[in-house]
Amino acid sequence: KNLKSPQKVEVDIIDDNFILRWNRSDESVGNVTFSFDYQKTGMDNWIKLSGCQNITSTKCNFSSLKLNVYEEIKLRIRAEKENTSSWYEVDSFTPFRKAQIGPPEVHLEAEDKAIVIHISPGTKDSVMWALDGLSFTYSLVIWKNSSGVEERIENIYSRHKIYKLSPETTYCLKVKAALLTSWKIGVYSPVHCIKTTVENELPPPENIEVSVQNQNYVLKWDYTYANMTFQVQWLHAFLKRNPGNHLYKWKQIPDCENVKTTQCVFPQNVFQKGIYLLRVQASDGNNTSFWSEEIKFDTEIQAFLLPPVFNIRSLSDSFHIYIGAPKQSGNTPVIQDYPLIYEIIFWENTSNAERKIIEKKTDVTVPNLKPLTVYCVKARAHTMDEKLNKSSVFSDAVCEKTKPGNTSK
């Protein structure tokens, strides 16, 4: 009896694992084995596919074959007993195009109100993703074990920290990788669960803000308790994208080590141009807090977001305010590459009631003022870009008296 060739061959590639599956054509024939050949593009000869010769099952693994994953290959299969079937040719394919990203490896660390997730590719030193290893991004689904309500977090890198969690609570999550450059979405990791710790005695510092004063950066934060010491550390933001070895070498800001106030001042030249992450930790001598949430700090934005400089022309019932570029030391104006909006606060000198104007223009009219009255004005700049969302500190207040009545022209 003639052997029928196998049908419906499927090629599954996950990371560097190459698996072939097929259907027997004739279930009634026993003791049949199967063998594959492969052919590279531009070659006429067929080569025996190692790992897939004389297979008794309907599955084989040819991961040991060192293929160029970007080169098209063709496969063929036949059944063998005393005689052999005809060859069945599989559609040609390029391994890289066909490959799926496998489940990533996930390690979790717990704090009282945060979880740190360390993610690395499931296959170490993968041949398939050798040129794309730095391009992996990840997404995750996280839920409270008790509730099952899922939250999705997209576009994260090899280390991600989730804040604002509850102490002594079990959270579960699963992670998948993506190569956006190749339109590839991976397979989810197994579910990993971790319980957050008991609430720490000392909470982390909150509401960290950076501003510029003279040639210095001023870093401020809020803290619940008095008589604490604080330390501040920085890290190049790009290192978060680099899967590297999961060791992030946070560095001390020398002027912000063991400070006793909820702010510290350090020279602008501590940082070269770039984007940094900053974090703050509190200690009372016996206990140490977990680190604060990390804030992004862009020297370019911070440097240019000085408080605006303005001139006031006083009329009887209004002020005309002309906003100019802030001056650096040496009286040179700061070049502003970002669109800004201006917040102008004014009040009667004898009163605390402040009024506010928000304006995109650099010439602003403050209306409805009383004649011969001293009003004070201060202003600050905001970036219009939601992602950057930065504000300068307020300028010093400037106080002027309005003119007598009937000088509004």
Epitope: H107, A110, D112, N200, E201, K249, F290
Partner: antibody, heavy 118, light 107 residues
Framework: QVQLVQSGAEVKKPGASVKVSCKAS????????IHWVRQAPGQGLEWMGR????????KYAPKFQGRVTMTADTSISTAYMELSRLRSDDTVVYYC???????????WGQGTLVTVSS | DIQMTQSPSSLSTSVGDRVTITCKTS??????VAWYQQKPGKAPKPLIY???YRYSGVPSRFSGSGSGTDFTLTISSVQPEDFATYYC?????????FGPGTKLDIK
């Protein structure tokens, strides 16, 4: 494979200094921290400090501050720990270890016995 | 400094027994705890990092658990090669510290 190989045993007089070396292979020393831990005979482990070989930033345990100096020469993948004003209770085994973030101290040197005796 | 206490300080056991060693820290260290095994005249051998993850090559009979201030190392079925001293280690904040050790010997 990853290895940390330390210099050989030393005998020193009280008041002298000792410099122990730790040669790294199988990894780039600049990408990690090198920690130093010591152990007195029959006693537990005691953390001394660490160095970032990339920029020579150090952290020392308060107990050794002022007496210990950690340095590194990245061109020969070697870290050093120098302890000055030696006393008899510095007769211990000194270990270097690689620190790998949340993987902690994942590789250790074989140890260097320093004997302080007059 | 973060103080670490380990109990028991020594433990006599037999091959096949299940053994649990506990470690307490004087403050919350999250999950920043590692465990090391040391035999006489040898360097410490890493067993567990980040409270519960085994280093590659470490047998599955070793497991770690806990968080915050209370941590545990368990050997599910003690083997002859497991008789040694075990140390816990916190790497949450400087200065890093070790527990005083637990000596496991043959009953």
């Amino acid at each position: 494979q990853v290895q940390l190989v330390q210099s050989g045993a030393e005998v020193k007089k009280p008041g002298a200094s000792v410099k122990v070396s730790c040669k790294a292979s199988g990894f780039n020393i600049k990408d990690y921290y090198i920690h130093w831990v010591r152990q007195a005979p029959g006693q537990g482990l005691e953390w001394m400090g660490r160095i970032d070989p990339e920029d020579a930033e150090t952290k020392y345990a308060p107990k050794f501050q002022g007496r210990v100096t950690m340095t590194a020469d990245t061109s020969i993948s070697t870290a050093y720990m120098e302890l000055s004003r030696l006393r008899s209770d510095d007769t211990v085994v000194y270990y270097c270890a690689r620190y790998h973030g949340y993987w902690a101290l994942d590789y250790w040197g074989q140890g260097t016995l320093v004997t302080v005796s007059s | 400094d973060i103080q670490m206490t380990q109990s028991p300080s020594s433990l006599s056991t037999s091959v096949g027994d299940r053994v649990t060693i506990t470690c307490k820290t004087s403050q919350n260290v999250g999950t920043n705890v590692a465990w090391y095994q040391q035999k006489p005249g040898k360097a410490p051998k890493p067993l567990i990092y980040s409270t519960s993850y085994r280093y590659s090559g470490v047998p599955s009979r070793f497991s770690g658990s806990g968080s915050g201030t209370d941590f545990t190392l368990t050997i599910s079925s003690v083997q002859p090669e497991d008789f040694a001293t075990y140390y816990c280690h916190q790497y949450f904040s400087y200065p890093y510290t070790f527990g005083p050790g637990t000596k496991l010997d043959i009953k």
